[in-house]
Interface confidence: low
Protein backbone atom coordinates (compact mmCIF):
# COMPACT_ATOMS: atom_id res chain seq x y z
CA UNK A 1 0.00 0.00 0.00
CA UNK A 2 1.25 3.53 -0.75
CA UNK A 3 2.48 5.47 2.24
CA UNK A 4 -0.07 7.82 3.70
CA UNK A 5 0.62 11.49 2.83
CA UNK A 6 1.00 13.54 6.00
CA UNK A 7 -0.60 16.97 6.12
CA UNK A 8 0.92 19.76 8.16
CA UNK A 9 1.17 19.94 11.05
CA UNK A 10 2.42 16.42 11.67
CA UNK A 11 4.91 14.75 13.97
CA UNK A 12 7.92 13.49 12.03
CA UNK A 13 9.11 9.92 12.33
CA UNK A 14 12.00 9.59 14.80
CA UNK A 15 15.30 10.41 13.05
CA UNK A 16 13.61 11.88 9.96
CA UNK A 17 13.44 15.52 8.82
CA UNK A 18 10.61 17.66 7.63
CA UNK A 19 9.88 17.88 3.93
CA UNK A 20 10.77 20.64 1.48
CA UNK A 21 9.08 23.95 2.35
CA UNK A 22 8.39 22.77 5.86
CA UNK A 23 10.17 23.49 9.12
CA UNK A 24 10.30 21.83 12.50
CA UNK A 25 8.62 23.91 15.18
CA UNK A 26 10.41 23.31 18.49
CA UNK A 27 7.46 24.44 20.60
CA UNK A 28 4.81 22.37 18.84
CA UNK A 29 7.31 19.60 18.04
CA UNK A 30 5.63 19.29 14.65
CA UNK A 31 6.53 19.74 11.00
CA UNK A 32 4.77 22.88 9.83
CA UNK A 33 4.45 24.81 6.57
CA UNK A 34 6.83 27.59 5.69
CA UNK A 35 5.51 30.82 4.21
CA UNK A 36 6.20 31.56 0.57
CA UNK A 37 8.43 34.45 -0.62
CA UNK A 38 6.54 37.72 -0.13
CA UNK A 39 4.91 36.44 3.04
CA UNK A 40 5.79 35.96 6.69
CA UNK A 41 4.45 33.91 9.61
CA UNK A 42 1.58 35.79 11.20
CA UNK A 43 0.70 32.93 13.56
CA UNK A 44 3.02 30.04 14.31
CA UNK A 45 1.72 26.50 14.12
CA UNK A 46 0.45 24.42 17.02
CA UNK A 47 -0.12 20.67 17.36
CA UNK A 48 -3.51 21.13 15.73
CA UNK A 49 -3.19 24.16 13.42
CA UNK A 50 -0.70 25.00 10.66
CA UNK A 51 1.29 28.20 10.20
CA UNK A 52 -0.81 31.22 9.25
CA UNK A 53 1.00 33.38 6.69
CA UNK A 54 0.38 36.99 5.73
CA UNK A 55 1.68 39.22 2.95
CA UNK A 56 4.61 41.51 3.59
CA UNK A 57 3.72 45.15 4.16
CA UNK A 58 4.91 47.93 1.85
CA UNK A 59 8.70 48.45 1.80
CA UNK A 60 9.30 45.04 3.33
CA UNK A 61 10.11 41.70 1.71
CA UNK A 62 11.01 38.05 2.13
CA UNK A 63 12.98 36.45 -0.66
CA UNK A 64 12.89 32.82 0.53
CA UNK A 65 10.45 30.32 1.94
CA UNK A 66 10.47 31.26 5.61
CA UNK A 67 8.80 31.32 9.01
CA UNK A 68 9.99 34.75 10.16
CA UNK A 69 7.56 36.76 12.28
CA UNK A 70 8.23 39.98 10.35
CA UNK A 71 9.36 40.71 6.81
CA UNK A 72 12.73 42.35 6.22
CA UNK A 73 12.88 46.08 5.55
CA UNK A 74 13.95 47.08 2.07
CA UNK A 75 17.13 49.11 1.87
CA UNK A 76 16.98 52.89 1.77
CA UNK A 77 16.38 54.73 -1.47
CA UNK A 78 19.31 54.82 -3.87
CA UNK A 79 21.60 57.82 -3.51
CA UNK A 80 22.22 60.35 -6.27
CA UNK A 81 25.35 58.52 -7.48
CA UNK A 82 23.40 55.27 -7.85
CA UNK A 83 20.67 53.84 -10.03
CA UNK A 84 17.99 51.43 -8.86
CA UNK A 85 18.51 48.24 -10.82
CA UNK A 86 15.95 46.25 -8.86
CA UNK A 87 12.92 47.78 -7.18
CA UNK A 88 11.73 46.90 -3.70
CA UNK A 89 8.89 44.37 -3.96
CA UNK A 90 7.33 41.95 -1.46
CA UNK A 91 9.71 39.27 -2.73
CA UNK A 92 12.97 41.12 -3.26
CA UNK A 93 15.05 43.91 -1.79
CA UNK A 94 15.92 47.08 -3.63
CA UNK A 95 19.30 46.86 -5.39
CA UNK A 96 21.33 50.01 -6.05
CA UNK A 97 24.29 49.99 -8.41
CA UNK A 98 26.65 52.79 -9.34
CA UNK A 99 25.72 55.03 -12.22
CA UNK A 100 27.92 55.20 -15.34
CA UNK A 101 31.29 56.81 -14.68
CA UNK A 102 31.28 55.58 -11.09
CA UNK A 103 32.41 52.34 -9.47
CA UNK A 104 31.54 50.50 -6.28
CA UNK A 105 34.13 51.37 -3.62
CA UNK A 106 32.29 49.48 -0.88
CA UNK A 107 30.02 46.62 -1.84
CA UNK A 108 27.37 44.87 0.21
CA UNK A 109 25.74 41.49 -0.19
CA UNK A 110 23.69 42.77 -3.11
CA UNK A 111 24.38 46.05 -4.84
CA UNK A 112 26.66 48.79 -3.60
CA UNK A 113 26.96 50.66 -0.31
CA UNK A 114 29.32 53.40 -1.52
CA UNK A 115 30.01 54.61 -5.05
CA UNK A 116 32.98 56.72 -6.10
CA UNK A 117 33.72 58.50 -9.39
CA UNK A 118 36.14 56.83 -11.75
CA UNK A 119 39.36 58.76 -11.74
CA UNK A 120 40.43 60.66 -14.82
CA UNK A 121 43.93 60.38 -16.25
CA UNK A 122 45.60 63.73 -16.62
CA UNK A 123 47.52 64.75 -19.77
CA UNK A 124 50.67 62.67 -20.09
CA UNK A 125 48.87 59.68 -18.59
CA UNK A 126 46.60 57.09 -20.11
CA UNK A 127 44.42 54.32 -18.81
CA UNK A 128 46.44 51.23 -17.99
CA UNK A 129 43.53 49.38 -16.41
CA UNK A 130 39.97 50.42 -17.11
CA UNK A 131 37.47 50.80 -14.33
CA UNK A 132 34.99 48.03 -13.67
CA UNK A 133 31.83 47.90 -11.58
CA UNK A 134 33.97 47.29 -8.51
CA UNK A 135 37.41 48.75 -9.27
CA UNK A 136 38.73 52.18 -10.12
CA UNK A 137 40.71 53.12 -13.20
CA UNK A 138 44.51 52.89 -12.99
CA UNK A 139 46.56 55.49 -14.85
CA UNK A 140 50.12 55.08 -16.09
CA UNK A 141 52.46 57.59 -17.68
CA UNK A 142 52.59 57.54 -21.46
CA UNK A 143 55.80 55.87 -22.58
CA UNK A 144 58.16 57.62 -24.99
CA UNK A 145 56.64 57.62 -28.47
CA UNK A 146 53.10 57.89 -27.08
CA UNK A 147 50.98 60.69 -25.64
CA UNK A 148 47.66 61.67 -24.13
CA UNK A 149 46.60 65.30 -24.19
CA UNK A 150 43.31 64.90 -22.34
CA UNK A 151 42.00 64.61 -18.81
CA UNK A 152 39.80 61.62 -19.29
CA UNK A 153 38.56 58.36 -17.85
CA UNK A 154 38.43 56.86 -21.34
CA UNK A 155 41.62 57.86 -23.14
CA UNK A 156 44.68 55.67 -23.53
CA UNK A 157 48.15 56.75 -24.60
CA UNK A 158 48.34 56.99 -28.40
CA UNK A 159 51.39 56.82 -30.64
CA UNK A 160 52.87 60.07 -31.90
CA UNK A 161 52.30 60.69 -35.55
CA UNK A 162 55.37 60.11 -37.68
CA UNK A 163 56.40 63.17 -39.64
CA UNK A 164 58.48 63.53 -42.79
CA UNK A 165 59.83 66.66 -41.12
CA UNK A 166 59.16 67.32 -37.43
CA UNK A 167 58.28 70.88 -36.49
CA UNK A 168 57.84 70.15 -32.77
CA UNK A 169 58.74 66.78 -31.27
CA UNK A 170 56.00 65.05 -29.36
CA UNK A 171 56.15 64.35 -25.66
CA UNK A 172 54.02 62.44 -23.18
CA UNK A 173 51.25 65.04 -23.22
CA UNK A 174 51.47 66.32 -26.80
CA UNK A 175 51.51 64.80 -30.25
CA UNK A 176 54.35 65.54 -32.61
CA UNK A 177 53.74 68.54 -34.87
CA UNK A 178 54.71 68.07 -38.49
CA UNK A 179 55.72 70.74 -40.96
CA UNK A 180 53.22 71.60 -43.69
CA UNK A 181 53.91 68.35 -45.52
CA UNK A 182 51.59 65.61 -44.40
CA UNK A 183 52.74 62.99 -41.92
CA UNK A 184 53.86 59.62 -43.21
CA UNK A 185 51.53 57.90 -40.75
CA UNK A 186 48.91 59.09 -38.37
CA UNK A 187 46.26 57.45 -36.29
CA UNK A 188 43.49 55.95 -38.37
CA UNK A 189 40.12 57.35 -37.25
CA UNK A 190 38.67 55.14 -34.55
CA UNK A 191 41.70 52.89 -34.42
CA UNK A 192 42.30 51.29 -31.05
CA UNK A 193 45.89 51.46 -29.85
CA UNK A 194 46.69 49.67 -26.66
CA UNK A 195 48.71 51.52 -24.04
CA UNK A 196 52.39 50.70 -23.62
CA UNK A 197 52.53 48.98 -20.24
CA UNK A 198 54.67 50.69 -17.67
CA UNK A 199 55.17 47.35 -16.02
CA UNK A 200 53.83 43.95 -16.89
CA UNK A 201 53.00 41.21 -14.49
CA UNK A 202 55.43 38.35 -14.68
CA UNK A 203 57.05 39.50 -17.89
CA UNK A 204 60.07 41.41 -19.12
CA UNK A 205 59.26 44.62 -20.93
CA UNK A 206 60.89 45.16 -24.28
CA UNK A 207 63.14 48.22 -24.57
CA UNK A 208 61.04 51.33 -24.86
CA UNK A 209 61.10 52.87 -28.33
CA UNK A 210 62.71 56.27 -28.67
CA UNK A 211 60.27 59.06 -29.54
CA UNK A 212 61.76 59.32 -33.03
CA UNK A 213 60.80 55.75 -33.92
CA UNK A 214 57.43 54.23 -34.57
CA UNK A 215 56.33 52.72 -31.27
CA UNK A 216 55.41 49.08 -31.17
CA UNK A 217 51.81 48.43 -30.27
CA UNK A 218 52.23 44.73 -29.71
CA UNK A 219 52.70 43.65 -26.13
CA UNK A 220 51.09 41.43 -23.56
CA UNK A 221 48.10 43.05 -21.95
CA UNK A 222 48.46 43.51 -18.23
CA UNK A 223 44.86 42.44 -17.69
CA UNK A 224 44.58 39.48 -20.04
CA UNK A 225 42.98 39.04 -23.44
CA UNK A 226 40.33 41.75 -23.47
CA UNK A 227 41.53 45.14 -24.72
CA UNK A 228 41.46 47.84 -22.08
CA UNK A 229 38.81 50.50 -22.21
CA UNK A 230 40.14 53.93 -22.92
CA UNK A 231 41.83 55.92 -20.13
CA UNK A 232 40.64 57.19 -16.76
CA UNK A 233 41.57 58.52 -13.30
CA UNK A 234 39.72 60.85 -10.94
CA UNK A 235 41.44 63.54 -8.99
Amino acid sequence: LPAQVAFTPYAPEPGSTCRLREYYDQTAQMCCSKCSPGQHAKVFCTKTSDTVCDSCEDSTYTQLWNWVPECLSCGSRCSSDQVETQACTREQNRICTCRPGWYCALSKQEGCRLCAPLRKCRPGFGVARPGTETSDVVCKPCAPGTFSNTTSSTDICRPHQICNVVAIPGNASMDAVCTSTSPTRSMAPGAVHLPQPVSTRSQHTQPTPEPSTAPSTSFLLPMGPSPPAEGSTGD
Epitope: A105, L106, A116, R119, K120, C121, R122, G124, F125, R129, T132, S135, D136, V138, C139, K140, P141, C142, A143, P144, N171, A172, P197, V198, S199, T200, R201, Q203, H204, T205, P207, T208, E210, P211, P222, M223, T233, G234, D235
Partner: antibody
Framework: EVQLQESGPGLVQPSQSLSITCTVS????????VHWVRQSPGKGLEWLGL???????DYSAAFISRLSINKDNSKSQVFFKMNSLQADDTAIYYC?????????????WGQGTTVTVSS | EIVLTQSPALMSASPGEKVTMTCSAS?????MYWYQQKPRSSPKPWIY???NLASGVPARFSGSGSGTSYSLTISSMEAEDAATYYC?????????FGAGTKLEIK
Amino acid sequence: EVQLQESGPGLVQPSQSLSITCTVSGFSLTSYGVHWVRQSPGKGLEWLGLIWSDGSPDYSAAFISRLSINKDNSKSQVFFKMNSLQADDTAIYYCARNDDGGDYVMDYWGQGTTVTVSS
Amino acid sequence: EIVLTQSPALMSASPGEKVTMTCSASSSVSYMYWYQQKPRSSPKPWIYLTSNLASGVPARFSGSGSGTSYSLTISSMEAEDAATYYCQQWTSNPLTFGAGTKLEIK
Protein backbone atom coordinates in the same frame (compact mmCIF):
# COMPACT_ATOMS: atom_id res chain seq x y z
CA GLU B 1 46.59 60.62 8.65
CA VAL B 2 48.10 58.26 6.09
CA GLN B 3 50.35 55.62 7.65
CA LEU B 4 52.01 52.38 6.56
CA GLN B 5 53.65 49.99 9.02
CA GLU B 6 55.71 46.95 8.13
CA SER B 7 56.00 44.00 10.50
CA GLY B 8 58.50 41.26 9.81
CA PRO B 9 60.56 38.55 11.50
CA GLY B 10 63.88 40.38 11.73
CA LEU B 11 66.01 37.28 11.29
CA VAL B 12 65.55 34.68 8.55
CA GLN B 13 67.54 31.48 8.01
CA PRO B 14 69.18 31.05 4.59
CA SER B 15 66.94 29.23 2.07
CA GLN B 16 63.87 30.02 4.18
CA SER B 17 61.05 32.36 3.20
CA LEU B 18 60.38 35.92 4.35
CA SER B 19 56.88 37.13 5.17
CA ILE B 20 56.14 40.79 5.88
CA THR B 21 52.78 42.43 6.52
CA CYS B 22 52.16 46.07 5.68
CA THR B 23 49.25 47.47 7.66
CA VAL B 24 47.88 50.73 6.33
CA SER B 25 45.59 53.40 7.77
CA GLY B 26 44.19 56.68 6.56
CA PHE B 27 43.36 55.36 3.10
CA SER B 28 41.72 52.40 1.40
CA LEU B 29 43.57 49.66 -0.45
CA THR B 30 40.72 49.70 -2.96
CA SER B 31 41.92 53.12 -4.14
CA TYR B 32 45.71 52.91 -3.87
CA GLY B 33 48.38 50.41 -4.80
CA VAL B 34 51.25 49.45 -2.50
CA HIS B 35 54.90 49.04 -3.56
CA TRP B 36 57.61 46.99 -1.93
CA VAL B 37 61.12 48.41 -2.05
CA ARG B 38 64.22 47.24 -0.25
CA GLN B 39 67.43 49.04 0.62
CA SER B 40 70.76 47.40 1.23
CA PRO B 41 74.21 48.99 1.52
CA GLY B 42 75.43 47.05 -1.51
CA LYS B 43 72.54 47.67 -3.89
CA GLY B 44 70.83 50.89 -2.80
CA LEU B 45 67.07 51.19 -3.36
CA GLU B 46 65.66 48.22 -5.24
CA TRP B 47 62.05 47.90 -6.41
CA LEU B 48 60.56 44.45 -5.83
CA GLY B 49 56.97 44.79 -6.95
CA LEU B 50 53.56 46.16 -6.08
CA ILE B 51 49.93 45.26 -5.78
CA TRP B 52 47.51 47.57 -7.58
CA SER B 53 44.27 48.88 -6.13
CA ASP B 54 42.39 46.33 -8.24
CA GLY B 55 44.34 43.50 -6.59
CA SER B 56 46.60 42.56 -9.48
CA PRO B 57 50.32 42.36 -8.74
CA ASP B 58 53.32 43.49 -10.76
CA TYR B 59 56.74 42.02 -10.00
CA SER B 60 60.25 42.99 -10.94
CA ALA B 61 61.51 40.38 -13.38
CA ALA B 62 64.50 39.78 -11.10
CA PHE B 63 62.22 38.55 -8.30
CA ILE B 64 59.21 37.10 -10.08
CA SER B 65 60.16 33.48 -9.48
CA ARG B 66 60.26 33.83 -5.69
CA LEU B 67 57.96 36.71 -4.82
CA SER B 68 54.25 36.93 -4.16
CA ILE B 69 52.23 39.95 -3.05
CA ASN B 70 48.58 39.90 -2.07
CA LYS B 71 46.26 41.83 0.21
CA ASP B 72 43.14 41.86 2.35
CA ASN B 73 41.26 45.09 1.68
CA SER B 74 38.93 44.64 4.64
CA LYS B 75 41.85 44.34 7.07
CA SER B 76 43.87 47.08 5.31
CA GLN B 77 46.81 44.72 5.04
CA VAL B 78 49.24 43.87 2.25
CA PHE B 79 51.20 40.64 2.43
CA PHE B 80 54.69 40.20 1.01
CA LYS B 81 56.34 36.79 0.72
CA MET B 82 59.75 36.05 -0.75
CA ASN B 83 61.16 32.54 -0.94
CA SER B 84 64.68 31.11 -0.93
CA LEU B 85 66.40 33.96 0.90
CA GLN B 86 70.17 34.28 0.83
CA ALA B 87 72.63 36.54 2.63
CA ASP B 88 72.42 39.21 -0.09
CA ASP B 89 68.69 39.57 0.63
CA THR B 90 69.64 41.24 3.92
CA ALA B 91 68.11 44.71 3.71
CA ILE B 92 65.55 47.14 5.04
CA TYR B 93 62.21 46.30 3.43
CA TYR B 94 59.74 49.15 2.87
CA CYS B 95 56.14 49.30 1.76
CA ALA B 96 55.06 52.53 0.09
CA ARG B 97 51.75 53.80 -1.20
CA ASN B 98 51.37 54.24 -4.95
CA ASP B 99 49.36 57.19 -6.14
CA ASP B 100 47.19 55.31 -8.63
CA GLY B 101 45.44 58.56 -9.49
CA GLY B 102 47.95 59.96 -11.92
CA ASP B 103 50.92 61.51 -10.14
CA TYR B 104 52.25 58.00 -9.99
CA VAL B 105 54.61 58.64 -7.13
CA MET B 106 55.37 56.68 -3.94
CA ASP B 107 53.84 59.37 -1.78
CA TYR B 108 53.93 57.71 1.66
CA TRP B 109 56.42 55.16 2.98
CA GLY B 110 56.50 52.87 5.98
CA GLN B 111 59.35 53.12 8.46
CA GLY B 112 60.86 49.92 7.07
CA THR B 113 61.60 46.57 8.69
CA THR B 114 65.16 45.32 8.92
CA VAL B 115 65.64 41.75 7.69
CA THR B 116 68.86 39.86 8.31
CA VAL B 117 69.47 36.57 6.53
CA SER B 118 71.85 34.51 8.60
CA SER B 119 72.17 31.12 10.20
CA GLU C 1 66.01 47.46 -17.60
CA ILE C 2 66.55 51.22 -17.64
CA VAL C 3 69.69 52.10 -15.68
CA LEU C 4 69.79 55.47 -13.94
CA THR C 5 73.23 56.96 -13.31
CA GLN C 6 73.43 59.76 -10.77
CA SER C 7 76.31 62.18 -10.59
CA PRO C 8 78.12 63.15 -8.60
CA ALA C 9 77.88 60.32 -6.08
CA LEU C 10 79.01 62.66 -3.31
CA MET C 11 79.07 66.43 -3.18
CA SER C 12 79.30 69.17 -0.60
CA ALA C 13 78.04 72.72 -0.75
CA SER C 14 78.21 75.80 1.40
CA PRO C 15 75.09 77.54 2.70
CA GLY C 16 73.69 79.83 0.00
CA GLU C 17 75.47 77.98 -2.82
CA LYS C 18 73.61 76.76 -5.90
CA VAL C 19 73.58 72.97 -6.21
CA THR C 20 72.83 70.84 -9.27
CA MET C 21 72.84 67.06 -9.43
CA THR C 22 72.04 65.00 -12.51
CA CYS C 23 70.40 61.72 -13.38
CA SER C 24 71.15 60.08 -16.71
CA ALA C 25 68.92 57.29 -18.07
CA SER C 26 70.20 54.50 -20.29
CA SER C 27 67.18 55.03 -22.55
CA SER C 28 64.52 57.69 -22.87
CA VAL C 29 61.99 58.05 -20.04
CA SER C 30 58.80 60.10 -19.89
CA TYR C 31 59.20 61.47 -16.38
CA MET C 32 61.66 61.49 -13.53
CA TYR C 33 60.95 61.31 -9.82
CA TRP C 34 63.25 62.33 -6.99
CA TYR C 35 63.26 61.19 -3.37
CA GLN C 36 65.12 62.63 -0.40
CA GLN C 37 66.44 60.35 2.33
CA LYS C 38 68.13 61.26 5.58
CA PRO C 39 69.97 58.78 7.83
CA ARG C 40 67.71 56.37 9.74
CA SER C 41 64.63 57.62 7.87
CA SER C 42 62.50 56.38 5.01
CA PRO C 43 62.75 58.04 1.60
CA LYS C 44 60.40 60.98 1.06
CA PRO C 45 58.89 62.03 -2.28
CA TRP C 46 60.61 65.24 -3.30
CA ILE C 47 59.96 65.93 -6.97
CA TYR C 48 57.41 64.13 -9.15
CA LEU C 49 56.63 64.21 -12.86
CA THR C 50 60.07 65.77 -13.50
CA SER C 51 59.36 69.25 -12.17
CA ASN C 52 56.56 69.19 -9.59
CA LEU C 53 57.51 69.69 -5.96
CA ALA C 54 55.98 67.28 -3.46
CA SER C 55 54.00 68.69 -0.56
CA GLY C 56 56.17 70.57 1.92
CA VAL C 57 59.24 70.80 -0.32
CA PRO C 58 60.82 74.28 -0.24
CA ALA C 59 60.57 76.40 -3.39
CA ARG C 60 64.36 76.58 -3.65
CA PHE C 61 64.22 73.08 -5.14
CA SER C 62 63.46 72.56 -8.81
CA GLY C 63 63.55 69.70 -11.26
CA SER C 64 63.98 69.66 -15.01
CA GLY C 65 64.96 67.51 -17.95
CA SER C 66 63.62 65.26 -20.67
CA GLY C 67 64.54 62.14 -22.59
CA THR C 68 67.63 60.68 -20.95
CA SER C 69 68.89 63.69 -19.01
CA TYR C 70 67.33 65.05 -15.82
CA SER C 71 68.49 67.27 -12.98
CA LEU C 72 67.58 68.46 -9.51
CA THR C 73 68.66 71.96 -8.53
CA ILE C 74 68.76 73.80 -5.21
CA SER C 75 68.97 77.54 -5.81
CA SER C 76 70.47 78.29 -2.41
CA MET C 77 71.79 75.47 -0.23
CA GLU C 78 70.59 75.25 3.37
CA ALA C 79 71.79 72.97 6.15
CA GLU C 80 68.52 71.01 6.21
CA ASP C 81 69.04 70.04 2.54
CA ALA C 82 71.93 67.75 3.46
CA ALA C 83 70.67 64.28 2.54
CA THR C 84 70.88 61.62 -0.13
CA TYR C 85 68.76 62.20 -3.24
CA TYR C 86 67.59 59.33 -5.43
CA CYS C 87 66.13 59.60 -8.91
CA GLN C 88 63.55 57.04 -10.06
CA GLN C 89 61.79 56.15 -13.30
CA TRP C 90 58.80 54.02 -14.16
CA THR C 91 58.59 54.28 -17.90
CA SER C 92 59.22 50.56 -18.23
CA ASN C 93 59.35 47.51 -16.05
CA PRO C 94 61.10 47.27 -13.68
CA LEU C 95 60.81 50.55 -11.87
CA THR C 96 64.41 51.57 -11.15
CA PHE C 97 66.26 53.94 -8.84
CA GLY C 98 69.58 55.67 -9.26
CA ALA C 99 72.36 54.89 -6.78
CA GLY C 100 71.89 58.29 -5.14
CA THR C 101 73.74 61.56 -4.72
CA LYS C 102 74.84 62.28 -1.17
CA LEU C 103 74.78 66.02 -0.50
CA GLU C 104 76.72 67.31 2.47
CA ILE C 105 76.93 70.78 3.98
CA LYS C 106 80.32 72.45 4.14
